[in-house]
């Protein structure tokens, strides 16, 4: 016999919530795998660019995205399938996963705050290497997409450490409309914008983390309530 009343409402709420979560994970995983396995990117992984080493931070970032996407899909599936099947085992596993993820988020938050300068440096390196790829291999659409995302999200273009060729390519092709890399090279420096994000706008990252944490707690409560509801309904 299935759950009834308010518990049934929780069941479908949990299903919808985790289906969206599973879809989001799928999108992240799909994009990350495209970035990783696109032939242009794969070729560049083994390439020495003159006297400059091949990009590596770019791939670390991609592997993190793959992991995040996979975990999201897995947890989303547990919540989604566990709710619709009214499986105490799956919901229990889902709850355990959420507890672990919550602990990881808290740990990552503390570590991130302590190492924010290093993270900012890595993000800048990630941007530089994506930019390097977009310039060196003009068919590397994945790298171009990453650069475009940086430029549009942070409303910046290039950095004060650009090579001559990168400056020229950016000036003609990759700056957001309305920005002029030559006159605004230092005003709209992406390195500066990244630094600003990790110092002056750190509260934004904090708010995002709190929102994620609240959602997790909310899901944990819902899964426990549903689990108890299933147990009670199976008794009668």
């Amino acid at each position: 016999m299935g759950v009834e009343g308010c518990t049934k409402c929780i069941k479908y709420l949990l299903f919808v919530f985790n289906f969206v979560f599973w879809l989001a994970g799928g999108v992240i995983l799909g994009v990350a795998l495209w970035l990783r396995h696109d032939p242009q990117t794969t070729n560049l992984l083994y390439l020495e660019l003159g006297d400059k080493p091949a990009p590596n931070t770019f791939y670390v970032g991609i592997y993190i995205l793959i992991a995040v996407g996979a975990v999201m899909m897995f947890v989303g599936f547990l919540g989604c399938y566990g709710a619709i099947q009214e499986s105490q085992c799956l919901l229990g596993t889902f709850f355990t996963c959420l507890v672990i993820l919550f602990a990881c988020e808290v740990a990552a938050g503390i570590w991130g705050f302590v190492n924010k300068d290093q993270i900012a440096k890595d993000v800048k390196q990630f941007y530089d290497q994506a930019l390097q790829q977009a310039v060196v291999d003009d068919d590397a659409n994945n790298a171009k997409a990453v650069v475009k995302t940086f430029h549009e999200t942070l409303d910046c273009c290039g950095s004060s450490t650009l090579t001559a060729l990168t400056t020229s390519v950016l000036k003609n092709n990759a700056c957001p409309s309305g920005s002029n890399i030559i006159s605004n090279l230092f005003k709209e420096d992406c390195h500066q914008k990244i630094d600003d994000l990790f110092s002056g706008k750190l509260y934004l990252i904090g708010i995002a983390a709190i929102v994620v944490a609240v959602i997790m707690i909310f899901e944990m409560i819902l899964s426990m309530v549903l689990c108890c509801g299933i147990r009670n309904s199976s008794v009668y």
Epitope: V136, A164, K171
Partner: antibody, heavy 119, light 112 residues
Framework: EVQLLESGGGLVQPGGSLRLSCAAS????????MSWVRQAPGKGPEWVSY????????DYADSVKGRFTISRDNSKNTLYLQMNSLRAEDTAVYYC????????????WGQGTLVTVSS | QSVLTQPSSASGTPGQRVTISCTGS?????????THWYQQLPGTAPKLLIY???NRPSGVPDRFSGSKSGTSASLAVSGLRSEDEAEYYC???????????FGGGTKLTVLG
């Protein structure tokens, strides 16, 4: 060994057109940015244009913008420069040069081809 | 008039050390763009001599060295030899002109 061999230069009247070619060998042509650099008699070199490996990106010096067009054929390992509306000040030796991204400069140059614009 | 200013000539006797300067501005050398040096022997194409301000490509003798400070760069040739007699050009990128720029060249003469 990297080799770049220009051809197509010669005497042309003002307002005329000319197409320069550059045959490349000794390196992976399709993976490299290529450039044209010219040198007027008794003067220093002057950058003219560049083209990216798959022809996505191109740029020109202000002095030739709208008149010159750079292109490439990766299947033939050849770089081209189509020069229209030629002026007396375009008289120079035109060099084809490989652009090194790693070094951010012109690391190999051809022997050059002379273009003379005169009536 | 070139964007990068070089002395038109320089000279020295064999074994001597000669320095060639290249003066730019805040839109090229001073903007952080690398300076490169080319050697052009009579009747030949320019050949890369120094890249990235101070690096030598393989095959270039260590008698040639480069440096950069502020808005200018310099090329030093120590232990001068007769085969060093050539035209030397500096090169950088200029943000105002949105292109690569060269110096007017310095004719190095080895005396005696």
């Amino acid at each position: 060994e990297v080799q770049l061999l220009e051809s197509g230069g010669g005497l042309v009247q003002p307002g005329g057109s000319l197409r320069l070619s550059c045959a490349a060998s000794g390196f992976t042509f399709s993976s490299n940015y290529m450039s044209w650099v010219r040198q007027a008699p008794g003067k220093g070199p002057e950058w003219v244009s560049y083209i990216s490996s798959s022809s996505t990106y191109t740029d020109y010096a202000d002095s030739v913008k709208g008149r010159f067009t750079i292109s490439r054929d990766n299947s033939k390992n050849t770089l081209y420069l189509q020069m229209n509306s030629l002026r007396a000040e375009d008289t120079a030796v035109y060099y084809c040069a490989r652009y090194s991204y790693g070094r951010d400069n012109f690391d190999y140059w051809g022997q050059g081809t002379l273009v003379t614009v005169s009536s | 008039q070139s964007v990068l200013t070089q002395p038109s000539s320089a000279s020295g006797t064999p074994g001597q050390r000669v320095t060639i300067s290249c003066t730019g501005s805040t839109s090229n050398i001073g903007a952080g763009y690398d300076t490169h040096w080319y050697q052009q022997l009579p009747g030949t194409a320019p050949k890369l001599l120094i890249y990235g301000n101070s690096n030598r490509p393989s095959g270039v003798p260590d008698r040639f060295s480069g440096s950069k400070s502020g808005t200018s760069a310099s090329l030093a040739v120590s232990g001068l030899r007769s085969e060093d007699e050539a035209e030397y050009y500096c090169q950088s990128y200029d943000t105002n002109l949105s292109g690569w720029v060269f110096g007017g060249g310095t004719k190095l003469t080895v005396l005696g």
